[in-house]
Interface confidence: low
Amino acid sequence: FEIALPRESNITVLIKLGTPTLLAKPCYIVISKRHITMLSIKSGERIVFTFSCQSPENHFVIEIQKNIDCMSGPCPFGEVQLQPSTSLLPTLNRTFIWDVKAHKSIGLELQFSIPRLRQIGPGESCPDGVTHSISGRIDATVVRIGTFCSNGTVSRIKMQEGVKMALHLPWFHPRNVSGFSIANRSSIKRLCIIESVFEGEGSATLMSANYPEGFPEDELMTWQFVVPAHLRASVSFLNFNLSNCERKEERVEYYIPGSTTNPEVFKLEDKQPGNMAGNFNLSLQGCDQDAQSPGILRLQFQVLVQHPQNESNKIYVVDLSNERAMSLTIEPRPVKQSRKFVPGCFVCLESRTCSSNLTLTSGSKHKISFLCDDLTRLWMNVEKTISCTDHRYCQRKSYSLQVPSDILHLPVELHDFSWKLLVPKDRLSLVLVPAQKLQQHTHEKPCNTSFSYLVASAIPSQDLYFGSFCPGGSIKQIQVKQNISVTLRTFAPSFQQEASRQGLTVSFIPYFKEEGVFTVTPDTKSKVYLRTPNWDRGLPSLTSVSWNISVPRDQVACLTFFKERSGVVCQTGRAFMIIQEQRTRAEEIFSLDEDVLPKPSFHHHSFWVNISNCSPTSGKQLDLLFSVTLTPRTVDLT
C-alpha cells in the first residue's frame, strides 16, 4: 500500500490496532521490513507499507483526520471530499474526521444529502455499520452532539465556534463520498440547531447534547422539524433528568409558525404536544446549576409523524357545481388567546393542500377532509350573492334562502350563511317572507333559538342594521328599499336539528321609498317587542321605517313605548312618528325631538307606526323600543 498526503493538506492518517479480538495470530504494519502496530502519516509524507496478515481488517483501523482552520483564513465551504480517496486506502474499518475551528461569531452548517441521518442512543449500532459522530465546542470543552446512522430524518446540523465530524465506514462498505457539505451561517446564538425533515410517516428519536451525560449548563439547543402539512407530529419524552437549578428554569419551548402564542413553554415533566400539523421547532433550555450539587439535565425524545386518525380519513364532498356567486370558507373560530399549547387544526382540499383556512367557490365539486383534533375549533362562513340586473326580468321573482344540505352535512359548525341581495337602484325593492313568523331579538325578549337572521343594508356607505330575527314570533314579512345582506347565524350545534325551521323567501318587488317596512301579525298569546333599526347606534339620519301591525277583528292591540322621551336631538330637520289607523286613516303625529312619547294606546283595527329621523347631533340618537299586546275585545277596557 502507498499513502501520499499532499503538502499543506492538513490531513493526518493514523493506522492503529482496533478493538481487541480473539484471533490467535497477530498482524502488523510492515514498513521497510519493520513490524509496527501504529503508523502515523502527516501532510506532505508518502509512505509505502504492507500488512503481515491476510485479513488486516480484523485487526486494524484507520483514521483520516483533516483539520480545517477557519480562524486564520477563508473556510473551504461546499461539498466535503473523502481524502485520500477510499480506493487508495487499505480495506480497514475507517474513520474520516473533519475538525473545523471557527470564531464564536461564525455559524457552521453541516448539510447531509440523502440518505439523511438517524440519531442512535448509547449501546445502539447502525445496521450498515456507517456511523456519523458529531461534536461541537464550547470554549475548550468538547460537546457531543450525537451519533447518527443513515436512513433517518436529520438533514442539517448548525453549530458555531467549531465542529468535529467523524464518519465511520466499515472496511467492506463501498462508500466513496462523505455525504455532507459545510456552509457558513450567521451566528446561531446557541449550542446547535438540528433540522429533521419528514417526507412521509415515520419517527425520529433524538437526544440532548452529551446524552446520556448531562446537557451543558445554561445552554440552548434547538430541533427544527419539517413536516408535510397533511401529516401530524407528536412529541413524547422517552427519558429525561432535571438538574438542580440555582437560577432560571429548565424548559422546552415550541415554536409553531403561524401560532399566535409563540413560543409555547413546557416543563419537561409536562405532557408534550401532539397532533401538530406542519413544521415546528423544539428548544431545550438549560439553567444555572447549583455548584455543590448540579445534577444533570438530559433528554431523549421521540417525534412521531403519522397520518391523523378518525375524521381526517373521511372525505366530504361539497357540491357547489350548481351554485352561482357563492363562496364557503372554513376557518378557525376566534378563541381567547391562551399560553396553553393548542395543536394545529387544518382543513384539506383533496386531502393534500392543508391550511387553517379554506375557501371553496361555486361552480365546482370539492372534496375536503380535516386534520384536526377537535372540529369544534373550526366553523363555516358562507356568502352567496343573488342579484338582479334587469328589473323587468326580476320583478315578482322569488328565491329561497336555504342552506344547502351538502353544507349541513359537513362535520363543522355553520357560523354564518350570508345572502347578499342586490337590486337595481331606484327600480326594485325586496321583500323577505319567512316560512315561520319571526321574532325580533331584544333585551326584553331575546331569541333563544339555535339560529337567527341578521338583516343589514348592503350598501357600503350606509350603516343600517335592521336587526336580528329568529323563528317563532309575529313578523310576517320584512320589506326593504335596497340592497341588503341576510345572514343566517347559528348559535348552537342544535341548529342541525332545527335546520328545518329555517326558510326565508326573497322576492323582488316594485321600488318603494321607505328604508324598511315590517309586517307584524301578533299572536294573542304573547307580547311582541319591536325596536328601531341600528339599536344602540341610532336610526341613520333622514331614515324612515314603518311597522304594519295587524289587529284581528275580535282583538284589541295595546301599543306601549318603553321610555318617556325619544332622546333624539336634531341638528337639522325634524324627527317624527305617525301612528295611523288603517281603516279610518286617522293619524296622530308626534314630534320625537320635542314631544313626550305617547302613553300606552289601544287600537281596535290594524294600524301603522312610522318613524322618520332627522339629522341628529352626535350622541343624541334615535332608538325606540315598543311592544304590541293583543287582548280579546270582550274585556272592558274602561
Partner: antibody, heavy 116, light 108 residues
C-alpha cells in the same frame, strides 16, 4: 377515481432494455411516492424502486441498483422505470403503486419477459 | 435490510372460520406494517396499514394487530371471496420496503 395504468412491458432479450410507464389519474403524483413492485411467475412480491417526485428522492432494491432508473414526469402525471441490462431473473409482472397509506393503489401490472 | 418472516406459507380453512396470519420483523419497524390481499392474475389490494388501521372500503372482518415486532392479520369469519394470498410488508424508514413471503389461504 384513482387509477394507475402500466404499459411498456413485453418480451426482451437478456442484456436488452425496456421502459415501463405508469400513467396516474385521479390524483397528482407530485404529492405521493411512486413505487414499482414486481412479481416473478408463481413467486411473491418484491419491491423494486421508488421515487418521491416532490423531493426527487429515489431508492432501489439492491437487485436492480445500477441497472434500473426510476423517474417521474409530474407534468404528464406519469412515473417511469427504465430497465437496462435485463436478465432472465427480471422476468415478472411489474406493478406500479402509489405510496400513501402504505401502497394504497396499484396498477393492473405489465408483464416483462426476458428470454432469448 | 429488514426481513419479514411470514407464517404459515399456506393454510386451508372453511367459510366462517377465524383465520390468523403472522409476520415477524427482523428488527423494530414500529407500526409501519401493511397487509395486502392478492387474487390470481390481479394486483394486490391494501387491507391494513399502520399495523392495525383498516383501509377504506375493506370489510370489518379484517383486522390487524401488533405486539413488538410480531404482526397479525385476522379474518374473523372467512368469506368465499377471501380465498387469496396475503402479504405483509414493512415500510419503516421508507426504504427498502420488504414483503413477507406470502400466505395462501385455500378452501379446505
Amino acid at each position: 377515481e384513482v387509477q394507475l395504468v402500466e404499459s411498456g412491458g413485453g418480451l426482451v432479450q437478456p442484456g436488452g432494455s425496456l421502459r415501463l410507464s405508469c400513467a396516474a389519474s385521479g390524483f397528482n403524483i407530485s404529492y405521493y411516492s411512486m413505487h414499482w413492485v414486481r412479481q416473478a411467475p408463481g413467486k411473491g412480491l418484491e419491491w423494486v424502486a421508488s421515487i418521491s417526485p416532490y423531493s426527487g428522492y429515489t431508492s432501489y432494491a439492491d437487485s436492480v441498483k445500477g441497472r434500473f432508473t426510476i423517474s417521474a414526469d409530474t407534468s404528464k402525471n406519469t412515473a417511469y422505470l427504465q430497465m437496462n441490462s435485463l436478465r432472465a431473473e427480471d422476468t415478472a409482472v411489474y406493478y406500479c403503486a402509489r405510496g400513501y397509506y402504505a401502497l394504497d393503489y396499484w396498477g393492473q401490472g405489465t408483464l416483462v419477459t426476458v428470454s432469448s | 435490510d429488514i426481513q419479514m418472516t411470514q407464517s404459515p406459507s399456506s393454510l386451508s380453512a372453511s367459510v366462517g372460520d377465524r383465520v390468523t396470519i403472522t409476520c415477524r420483523a427482523s428488527q423494530s419497524v414500529s407500526s409501519a406494517v401493511a397487509w395486502y390481499q392478492q387474487k390470481p392474475g390481479k394486483a394486490p389490494k391494501l387491507l391494513i396499514y399502520s399495523a392495525s388501521s383498516l383501509y377504506s372500503g375493506v370489510p370489518s372482518r379484517f383486522s390487524g394487530s401488533r405486539s413488538g415486532t410480531d404482526f397479525t392479520l385476522t379474518i374473523s369469519s372467512l368469506q368465499p371471496e377471501d380465498f387469496a394470498t396475503y402479504y405483509c410488508q414493512q415500510y419503516y424508514y421508507f426504504y427498502p420496503f420488504t414483503f413477507g413471503q406470502g400466505t395462501k389461504v385455500e378452501i379446505k
